[in-house]
Every structure is written in C-alpha cells, then in structure tokens.
C-alpha cells in the first residue's frame, strides 16, 4: 500500500522522464522500469537510501533527491549509476560524506552537496575518481568548518565551483590550488580571515571568481605570500557583500595583484561610507590595471546624500570601456567624472533617478567623448524634447534606450546626437509620433505605447518594433523603404494584403500575430495559399486567431475554413 | 494625471498610534520614492522620512526613527506611515510627496490632519 | 543637520512689482556642480507646490515669472511681476544631506 501511495504522486512520459517532487514520498519507488533516464524526487520525505533501491535503473542520468531529509545512503546505493551524469543531494541531513558513493559515478558531471550538516569533505578524497565532473556545489552554512588538502585532489577542470565556507575556520593551505582550472569559482564566506590564503591558491586557475554575502568592513590587504603574478582570474563578482571607504581602499590593492582582471561586478553590495576612497597610505595610486568593464547592481549606500568628492576614483576610470551602474539611486553623475571617462563606449544607469536637468551636469562637454551606448531605462526623464537637447554634446552617441520613463506628449521636433542610430522609447505613455524621431535612425522600438497611427517617413529604418499599441494597419511601407524587421503583434489589425507585404521591398521578418484578425475569404485565401508567407511571419501559425466572424474566434488563421455560401454572398 | 491621495482626518489619544496612507495613481508607483512631510498648525514643514517601494529601503529623520514607520503595498500603489507614542505635539497636517530626480517632492498629497488630544 | 534661513519674513508687495526671496543655508548645499535647492509656494489649505529644483530648474507648469538663482549656500527665488494668485507661503527646502530641511518661510501678501 505504501508502495502504491508513492507510486501515486509519480508521473513518467515516453521519454523517461519521471517527475515526483513535493509529495509524500518516503522512500524511492521501487516499480519502475530500467528505461527511467531521469528522477526528480525532491521535496519529499525519503530520508533513507539503501543499495538496492536504485539497482535497476542502469540509464539513469538524472538523480535529483535535493530537500528530502536523507541521513544515511548505503555505500553501494550508486554501484549500477555508471550513466549518471547529474546528482543532486543538497539540504539533506548527510553529516558524513562517503567517498564510495560516488567512485561507481564514472559519467558524473553535476554533483551538488551544498546544504548537508558534514564538517568536512570525508576522510578521502570523495571526487578523484568523477574525471568528467565539471558542476561541483559543497559547503553549508554552519558546520562546514574545514577545507582539507586532499577535498579536492583528482579534479582537473570544473566550469563551476560552488564552495559554501560562511563559517570557514580552517583552510589548509594549497587545497584549492589542486584544481587546474576554473572558470567560475563561488565562494561564500561571512568573515574575511582566511580570504587571502584562499585567495593565493586560486590566482592561477580561476577566471571567474565570485565572493558572497562577506564582511569586508574591516577587510586589510597584506602582500600576498606568493611570488606568482600569472593570473588568471579576468572577471571578480562581490555579491551581497559589505564594504566600507576605507576597505574598499584595500579591496582595489587586492584587485590591482590581478594583472589580468578585465571585468568588475558588484551586486546587491552595500558601501558604509560617504565616498573618501583615499585610504590611510594614500601616498600609494592603485593601478586599475587592463578593468575595461564595470557592472554594479542595486548598490545600497546608507549615507549616500552625505557623499564627499568622487575625485580619488576619477583617474582609476580613464580604460573603463563599459559601466552599469542600475538600481543604485543614481541622481547625478559629476561632470568631472563624466569627463575622465575617456575610453567609456558603454554606459547603463537603468531603475535610476535621473532628470534631465541633472543630466545635463552629466553630460557636460566633453563628458563621455567615446560614448556610443546611453541606457536610461526607468529613470524619472519626463521631456522627450529636453532629453534629447541635454544628449547633443555625446558626438559619437549612435545607441539611445529612454524606455520605461514617463514622456506621454511627443513634440514636433527635437534635436538628437547626429550619428544616432537606434532609439528606444518603448513603454513611455506616448500617444503619438512626430518628427521629434531622428531620420538617422535604424532600429527604433516604440512598443507598448498608445499609438494608433504610425506615419513617418524613416528613410533609413531597418527595424520597427512597434508591438502592443493600438494601431489598426500595417504602416506605408512607402515611408520605411529599408525596413528589414516589423514587429507589430498585440495590436488592433484587423486585416493585411498580399498587396500591403509586397510593397515592403526589402522586408525579411513580420511579427503581427495577437492582433484582432477579420478572417474575411480573401485574408484566409491569402494567408492559406501563399506558402513563403510562414518564412516571414516568425509567429505563424500559432499567433495568428481569428476575431470574427464569431463562429470562428479564437481559432488559428491557418485552420479556419468558411463554407462556400460564405465566402459567394 | 499623477495624484497622490491620503485617508481621512484623525482624532488620537496620547501613547496611541496612528496610521496614514496614501495612494498613488498616474505613473509606475515603484520607479519614485515617496516621503512624508509634517506640518504643524501655524508653522514650517518638518520632514519625516521617505521609502523606495522598489525595494523597501527607508531612511528617517532621527527626531522620528523610534517612532515613525513607512511600509508600502506595491500591489496597491499604497504607501503608509505610522506613528506611535502620539504626543499633543504630533498634532499636525501630515503630507505624502513624491520624490523624483532624488532630490525633489514634485506632487503632494492634499495632506491628513492629526489631531492629538485627551 | 543643515539649517535654512529665509528671510524676508514677510514680504508686501503691489501687483507689478518684483519679489526677492532669501535663503541661506548653514552649509554648502552644493553636489558636484548641482545645488540642491528647492523652492515650494504654499497657499492656504493647500499642499505646497514644487517651483524650482536645483536651485534653478523651473518645474514644469509653473510661469516663467518665476526664476531661482544662487549656489552654495545663498539662493534667490524671484518673480519678476507680483500677482494677486501669488500670495502664500513660500519655503526652501535643502536635499543635501539628511535629514532634508526646509526653511521657515517667507509670506508673500499682496498691499
């Protein structure tokens, strides 16, 4: 009986693909075929695992047992898993690690461990039989205390490594360094004692390197006790860390060992300070090194209307090609800042505050002189005409996105940077368009907005994107006689000819589903016959139902069928 | 059109507690910040504290941390401030603003009226 | 915390003629170029209205009679021509640093 109730909550399609999480399970079912290729068991209530109950299932390749609250696995359970490529075991109760179970995984390549009460990672090493793993995730967040010199010995390359040290007391030094290569390390540590000693295994075979949810606010660099400068890390992520002027001071010192760091990414960080980076020996210049890209994200900076002057960063920004700098609360970018940003090709300040009249301070002349990518997406810029008028000083602006600001009226005419070249002012409230867009441009996307009418003459416009508004045809292909891509779904068509498509010469792609089709004879004869059409319309058939007449709404374009009578009246 | 409206007058005892709202309409509630201004009868605006519904954060006047707080239901564009240990000295116009550009409180609310008094 | 002075306390005016406000502030207001300075009139029972931003941005509706000046710590809120709708209360308010403070005000009365 129990049996069957397990079986209950489990589904499997043709392909052997078994799906039985969030039930009641409390062991692994036992009635099912050897053709299972895949078993999604988590959030159950198995807590036991012995060496017969997966036996049969010799194609397994997908184990998923995360969140049950397994306690004991019996050294053989996995002996018959040779095919198993992906092993999920996180947030179990597994406090010891044996290196057993996972000797017979000879196909592993996704092992997750993360979330087990273990101190350690065994006695042996538990991975130097797995030589195709390349997903590994161990650590938790109390009692894993230990990294040990053999935990991970045998493994040559991981695309990703996922350690969870938030209560690291021990690091036993060159435990990481065994591991060749890394492409992206995740480290989770709440102190910062032992970062540098990890720090100095990891230089030369990680790209990618990530710390989490860190204290760094009494963070102090030493001079790292290693005579290596061939690194290999070129991306470093600070996530949910905190940080204060002064440690962010020694964090740059740090970074500056990395001759090959080309990307910086802090998010979800918060800075305790007011902006005086200068550090206590501020006799020493940092040197930004080859850092072209720099990406922060919801940055939360408690004294942030108490900042001082920015200008001990400014000289660290003179290579930066591209900032993101999103959902920080950015108001104003100093126009001293602006102006040291010489190299600076890319710059997104998305969910901001920005307005044009602070703008203007930030886009001073001179500022941004490389500039050719602007995004100002959900910023607080309400003047089309105004946005564009602060932009002119930007020459070689060619990439504007303004969308999700509020403009509602559109003016006759405005003035933009001359080379511009794509435009973004989807979700803006505008009800109509005028000659304020550019005739420069190439891509423009006005959709969801409230227009009904689209007649601009855009000489050189390849792609339109003008999706959910509330047009009611195609526009004058006339006006557009480079388009390349029209995107005109969710609106108010009701019909379209093979007249209307021939007259876009050059169009290649047309998206118009989800409008409201009058499925009249001659638009489902046209649409029926003409088989070259599914090339264009990227959406057909799927998107394409009728409105009416009412007997056949809702119904796909391509199915429909009316009666003679109908169609002869 | 952006409005910001605020609930009905309040009549409280000292030691009670009062809470205000005030909901918004006319542009997208969690790109703005919304702060609360006071205003005794006769006198100057006091400024209370603002939030981001965007994602919570809050920041206060320290004459008001103990006792003032602001929550926000995004799903009805609806910000609140409570404030506890009412005293006759709370009596007051109390105002909802809208924040823009950071810096700038560019809609009020038409304002709350508390009064407190035994 | 910042603190504002306005002054004139009141100012009495006859339609026509041109108001000078004050307002100085305890510290510079200034932010990397931008002061942040704002100016709100208030008329009786009414919630104040936004006039100026950063010193010298007028918000939009508002007539051009109305111009800011100043930075660091003196600002100017003119009107070039007093009108009978001008009356009220008129307060600067500093968003340098926190907390945000507003001046006392100056009262506009029309003789």
């Known amino acids: 009986k129990e049996e069957s109730s397990n079986q209950a909550s489990l589904s499997c399609d043709h392909n052997g693909i078994c799906k039985g999480s969030s039930g009641s399970l409390n062991s692994i079912p036992s009635g099912l075929t050897e053709a299972v290729k895949s078993l999604d068991l988590s959030n159950n209530r198995i807590t036991y695992i012995s060496n017969s109950d997966l036996q049969r299932y010799v194609n397994l390749q997908a184990l998923v047992l995360t969140s049950n609250g397994i306690n004991t696995i019996e050294e053989d359970s996995f002996s018959s898993l040779g095919r198993l490529e992906h092993l999920d075991l996180s947030y179990n109760y597994l406090s010891n690690l044996s290196s057993s179970w996972f000797k017979p995984l000879s196909s592993l390549k996704f092992l997750n461990l993360l979330g087990n009460p273990y101190k350690t990672l065994g006695e042996t090493s538990l991975f130097s039989h797995l030589t195709k793993l390349r997903i590994l995730r161990v650590g938790n967040m109390d009692t894993f205390t230990k990294i040990q010199r053999k935990d991970f010995a045998g493994l040559t390359f991981l695309e990703e490594l996922e350690i969870d040290a938030s209560d690291l007391q021990s690091y036993e030094p060159k435990s990481l360094k065994s591991i060749q290569n890394v492409s992206h390390l995740i480290l989770h540590m709440k102190q910062h004692i032992l970062l540098l000693e990890i720090f100095v295994d990891l230089t030369s075979s990680v790209e990618c390197l990530e710390l989490r949810d860190t204290d760094l606010d009494t963070f102090h660099f030493s001079e790292l006790s290693t005579g290596e400068t061939n690194s290999l890390i070129k991306k470093f992520t600070f996530r949910n860390v905190k940080i204060t002027d002064e440690s962010l001071f020694q964090v740059m010192k740090l970074l500056s060992q990395i001759s090959g760091l080309l990307e910086l990414e802090f998010d979800d960080c918060t800075l305790n300070g007011v902006g005086d980076f200068r550090g206590s020996d501020n006799d020493r210049v940092i040197d930004p090194g080859k850092v072209e890209t720099v990406t922060i994200r919801r940055l939360h900076i408690p004294q942030f209307y108490s900042f001082n002057d920015l200008s001990t960063l400014y000289p660290l920004t003179e290579r930066v090609k591209r900032i993101t700098v999103e959902n920080s609360k950015v108001f104003l970018v100093p126009c001293l800042l602006s102006r040291h940003l010489k190299s600076l090709e890319y710059l997104d300040l998305s969910e901001n505050l920005m307005v044009e009249e602070y703008l203007k301070n930030s886009a001073c002349e001179d500022a941004w002189p490389s500039l050719q990518t602007l995004i100002l997406r959900q910023n607080h810029l309400a003047s089309l005409g105004k946005t564009g008028e602060t932009l002119l000083t930007l020459k070689n602006l060619t990439n504007l996105d303004i969308s999700k600001n509020t403009f509602h009226y559109m003016p006759e005419t405005c003035q933009w940077p001359e080379k511009m070249k794509y435009l973004n002012l989807s979700s803006t409230r505008i009800h109509s368009v005028t000659g304020c867009i550019p005739k420069t441009l190439e891509i423009l996307d006005i959709s969801n907005n409230n227009l009904n009418l689209f007649s601009l003459n855009l000489p050189q416009l390849k792609e339109l994107y003008i999706s959910r508004n509330k047009l009611m045809t195609l526009p004058d292909a006339s006006l557009l006689p480079m388009l390349l891509v029209l995107k005109i779904s969710r609106n108010t068509i009701t019909t379209f000819s093979k007249e209307q498509l021939d007259s876009f010469h050059t169009l290649k792609t047309l998206e118009a589903g989800g409008n409201n089709f009058i499925c009249s004879c001659e638009f489902l004869s046209f649409t029926q016959e003409q088989q070259a059409l599914a090339k264009v319309l990227v959406d057909w058939p799927a998107n394409y139902l009728c409105d009416s007449p009412s007997h056949v709404r809702g119904q796909r374009v391509q199915d429909v069928r009316l009666s003679v009578s109908e169609c002869h009246r | 059109q952006v409005q910001l409206v605020q609930s009905g007058s309040e009549l409280k005892k000292p030691g009670a507690s009062v809470k205000l709202s005030c909901k918004a309409s006319g542009f997208t509630f969690t790109t703005y910040g919304i702060n609360w201004v006071r205003q005794a009868p006769g006198q100057g605006l006091e400024w209370i504290g603002w939030?981001?519904?965007?994602?919570?954060?809050?920041n206060f006047n320290e004459n008001f941390k103990d006792r003032a707080t602001i929550t926000v239901d995004t799903s009805a564009s609806t910000a609140y401030m409570e404030l506890s240990s009412l005293r006759s000295e709370d009596t007051a116009v109390y105002f909802c603003a809208r924040l823009t550009g950071g810096t700038f409180l560019d809609y009020w609310g038409q304002g709350t009226t508390v009064t407190v008094s035994s | 915390d910042i603190v504002l002075t306005q002054s004139p306390a009141t100012l009495s005016l006859s339609p026509g003629e041109r108001a000078t406000l004050s307002c100085r502030a305890s510290e510079s207001v200034e932010y990397y170029g931008t002061s942040l300075m704002q100016w709100y009139q208030q008329k009786p029972g009414q919630p104040p209205k936004l006039l100026i931003f950063g010193a010298s941005n007028v918000e939009s509706g508002v007539p051009d009679r109305f111009s800011g000046s100043g930075s660091g710590t003196d600002f100017t809120l003119k009107i070039s021509r007093v009108e009978a709708e001008d009356v009220g209360m008129y307060f600067c308010?500093?968003?340098?640093?926190?907390?945000?403070?507003f001046g006392g005000g100056t009262k506009v009365e029309i003789k």
């Open positions: 939030i981001y519904p965007r994602d919570g954060s809050t």
């Open positions: 308010q500093q968003s340098r640093k926190l907390p945000w403070t």
